[in-house]
């Protein structure tokens, strides 16, 4: 994956009088790129799914969660090389016999058209054009995400 990167910085707003602040990410850090309300980090190197999951976690982020087909397409547009696969935060739950996002929700069958089998030790990868079921032990690249947060929430005293 090779795409231009916006140089952004993390800027946590200071609390001010009559304002409650929720510390969070207001801009994307360097090496991360913004896609709508998310910052995405496309790895350069390869790992199995579990290590990719752990890497995102240590970066105070998560493997990519895709809300709908529209977000999938916009993410795929950031992938320059057709041949490269990236892990996302979706794997097969054997106990529930369904695709499960790492946030605990299940895949809406209309969201992604997955190529490959839904079976034990299967994890989901995306390429520039498709979505694939792969053995979770396969070493490929991965995408981490951080959510951008609103700048501030104003709280006004009672009248």
């Amino acid at each position: 994956q090779k795409s231009s990167i916006e140089k952004c910085s993390v800027d946590i707003q200071q609390s001010r009088n009559k304002t409650t602040e929720r510390p969070g990410l207001l801009n994307c850090p360097i090496y991360w790129q913004q896609l709508r309300e998310k910052c995405l980090l496309f790895s350069h190197t390869v790992n199995p799914w579990n290590n990719s999951l752990a890497d995102c976690s240590t970066k105070e982020s998560s493997l990519l969660l895709i809300r709908d087909k529209d977000e999938l397409i916009h993410t795929q547009n950031l992938i320059r090389d057709k041949a490269i696969l990236f892990w996302i935060g979706l794997n097969f739950s054997l106990s529930e016999k369904n695709w499960k996002w790492i946030n605990g929700s299940f895949l809406n069958s209309n969201d992604l058209e997955i190529r490959g089998d839904a079976k034990e030790n299967s994890c989901i990868s995306i390429s520039q054009t498709s979505v694939y079921s792969e053995y979770c032990s396969t070493e490929i690249r991965w995408i981490c995400q951080k959510e951008l947060t609103p700048v501030r929430n104003k709280v006004y005293p009672d009248s």
């Epitope: 090779k2 990167i5 090496y31 790895s43 190197t45 790992n47 752990a54 105070e60």
Partner: antibody, heavy 117, light 111 residues
Framework: EVQLVESGGGLVQPGGSLRLSCAAS????????MHWVRQVTGKGLEWVST???????KYSGSVKGRFTISRENAKNSLYLQMHSLRVGDTAVYYC???????????WGQGTLVTVSS | NFMLTQPHSVSESPGKTVTISCTRS????????VQWYQQRPGNSPTIVIY?????PSGVPDRFSGSIDSSSNSASLTISGLKTEDEADYYC??????????FGGGTKLTVL
């Protein structure tokens, strides 16, 4: 301010062992991959080893089986345990911070390892 | 594994433009990002270009990077050469199993 400070270099005989350390400060150490890179005086840079945030490790062919990279996040420290040292391992050893992939955006000042009888 | 080959040395006058090449021996230059590092005498390397053509903050815009698939090479171009640019320059990439690869280095002399 990001700082990487290597230590532990010195003179050792062929076949001997040495442990290098890299003290990191000014950033959240646990969220970064880390590399060791070495340089023979007057020569080019040579990658030695990488440790990922998940603890996964990689080694160059020339050191695999002899060197072990490790990290201690609680101490913001990176290590390189070197065994069966050879004359050809003589070099300045740098630790570097890797925000993503091979990128080394900060380098330490280096520590000199001399293997000689 | 592949190699990255750089010219041993290049030289140019102040104010001129110089380009340093980095040719990948096998596999596509476009398949993995290329970084460039500057190492002044007696100092540790510093990054001047990452991800083929991105410039870290603090690096002058006189420095630019590119890749050329037809020659399977990456290039570092320095315009408006200054005497302070005199240094060794190294390209760097990585292979399919996460091994980092450095070029042999190019000594830039500003005449």
């Amino acid at each position: 301010e990001v700082q990487l400070v290597e230590s532990g270099g010195g003179l050792v005989q062929p076949g001997g062992s040495l442990r290098l350390s890299c003290a990191a400060s000014g950033f959240t150490f646990s969220t970064y991959d880390m590399h060791w890179v070495r340089q023979v005086t007057g020569k080019g840079l040579e990658w030695v080893s990488t440790i990922g945030t998940a603890g996964d490790t990689k080694y160059s062919g020339s050191v695999k089986g002899r060197f072990t990279i490790s990290r201690e996040n609680a101490k913001n420290s990176l290590y390189l345990q070197m065994h069966s040292l050879r004359v050809g391992d003589t070099a300045v050893y740098y630790c570097t911070r890797a925000p993503v992939g091979a990128i080394s955006d900060y380098w330490g000042q280096g520590t000199l390892v001399t293997v000689s009888s | 594994n592949f190699m990255l080959t750089q010219p041993h040395s290049v030289s140019e006058s102040p104010g001129k433009t110089v380009t340093i090449s980095c040719t990948r021996s096998s596999g596509s230059i476009a398949s993995n990002y290329v970084q460039w590092y500057q190492q002044r005498p007696g100092n540790s390397p510093t990054i001047v270009i990452y991800e083929d053509n991105q410039r870290p903050s603090g690096v002058p815009d006189r420095f630019s990077g590119s890749i050329d698939s037809s020659s399977n090479s990456a290039s570092l171009t320095i315009s408006g050469l200054k005497t302070e640019d005199e240094a060794d320059y190294y390209c760097q990439s990585y292979d399919s199993i996460n091994h980092v690869v450095f070029g042999g280095g190019t000594k830039l002399t500003v005449l």
